[in-house]
């Protein structure tokens, strides 16, 4: 694969990663695909410091991250271990709420207006954040 040594235009560098903040909305899966088309992934939050950085850039707006439990357990899109990793859920979240009337529960995680996390219906058109690591050879995932 190829190595990225500096961030693309319109991306923000922070702690050896590049971040791109959308200004419009997509469903979680479409946002995920968008990041893949950018050779990136939905943001994976691994520390309080990274949480504060992302929160600062997105402001008080619902924003998708790369965390979901569509196949059962919660998983980060880049394979980062969820159980042992950083978490910042709102109180009593995630709750897989079924009361929204849209069918099913809530399988995708997003930053809320105060930065803490909530699980929500994956089809909601929220903003999103893409992330790609610098100095890391790009992988060749399977065809979609």
């Amino acid at each position: 694969g190829s190595e990225r040594t500096c961030c693309p235009v319109n991306w923000v560098e922070h702690e050896r990663s590049c971040y791109w903040f959308s200004r419009s909305g997509k469903a979680w899966a479409d946002a995920d695909n968008y990041c893949r088309l950018e050779d990136a992934h939905l943001v994976v939050v691994t520390s309080w410091e990274e949480q504060k950085f992302v929160q600062h850039h997105i402001g008080p707006v619902n924003t998708w991250m790369g965390l979901h439990d569509q196949n059962g357990p919660w998983k980060w899109v880049d394979g980062t271990d969820y159980e042992t990793g950083f978490k910042n859920w709102r109180p009593e979240q995630p709750d897989d709420w079924y009361g929204h009337g849209l069918g099913g529960g809530e399988d995708c995680a997003h930053f809320t207006d105060d930065g803490r996390w909530n699980d929500d219906v994956c089809q909601r058109p929220y903003r999103w954040v893409c992330e790609t690591e610098l100095d890391k050879a790009s992988q060749e995932p399977p065809l979609l």
């Epitope: 694969g1 190829s2 693309p8 235009v9 319109n10 419009s24 909305g25 997509k26 469903a27 899966a29 479409d30 695909n33 968008y34 893949r36 088309l37 950018e38 050779d39 058109p125 790009s138 992988q139 060749e140 995932p141 065809l143 979609l144």
Partner: antibody, heavy 121, light 107 residues
């Protein structure tokens, strides 16, 4: 000047193969996702495939999945479409196009002139 | 898949006329919509992106509007070079899909 030049079209038999190429110039090729779009004779436009800048991620229309493969060689500034198991309904003009408008994937801003693929026995 | 339905399929108009073409998405695509112009034997040309943003070097007589599921392309005063076929494209979700096209013909 940004330019895209397709080649490789021609006549193929049903079940046969062709490889289309698209030579890019005038921009940093590896920084942009690319796509193929086709147009059957007298018909509308149909999106076929897209590929990320590194080539690491690809997306395909259901109509070509398992038969067509999009790829790129950034050292040669060239985009490819490998077309296998060709069918009569694949007959079309094939366009390559550059993705990215205002740093967003709102669509294709630069197109090649197209190359014609005819599938017939 | 998201279906894009354009109307009308063709329209006859005269130079100076105001022409409006609509595109309806089968589900919400916010503003992930572009409009293209295509002339016979030529590649499509981008006119509008993000539903309402005018591509550079495109004449200001072209404008786009809409969000969600209903979108409009308007040519405020048709010029001889505007007789062509127009397509909408959604890039909200894969597979990306085009409308079936609207042919603008000389009356």
């Amino acid at each position: 000047e940004v330019q895209l030049l397709e080649s490789g079209g021609g006549l193929a038999q049903p079940g046969g193969s062709l490889r289309l190429s698209c030579a890019a110039s005038g921009f940093t090729f590896s920084s942009y996702a690319m796509t193929w779009v086709r147009q059957a004779p007298g018909k509308g436009l149909e999106w076929v495939s897209a590929i990320s800048g590194s080539g690491g991620n690809t997306f395909n229309a259901d109509s070509v999945k398992g038969r067509f493969t999009i790829s790129r060689d950034n050292s040669k500034n060239t985009l490819y479409l490998q077309m296998n198991s060709l069918r009569a309904e694949d007959t079309a003009v094939y366009y390559c196009a550059k993705l990215g408008i205002d740093y967003y994937y709102y669509g294709m801003d630069v197109w090649g002139q197209g190359t014609t693929v005819t599938v017939s026995s | 898949d998201i279906q894009m339905t354009q109307s009308p399929s063709s329209v006859s108009a005269s130079v100076g006329d105001r022409v409006t073409i609509t595109c309806r998405a089968s589900q919400d695509i916010t503003t992930w919509l572009a409009w293209y112009q295509q002339k016979p034997g030529k590649a499509p040309k981008l006119l509008i992106y993000d539903a309402s943003s005018l591509q550079s070097a495109v004449p200001s007589r072209f404008s786009g509007s809409g969000s969600g599921t209903d979108f409009t392309l308007t040519v405020s005063s048709l010029q001889p070079e505007d007789f062509a076929t127009y397509y909408c494209l959604q890039t909200n979700s894969f597979p990306w899909t085009f409308g079936q096209g609207t042919k603008v013909e000389i009356k």
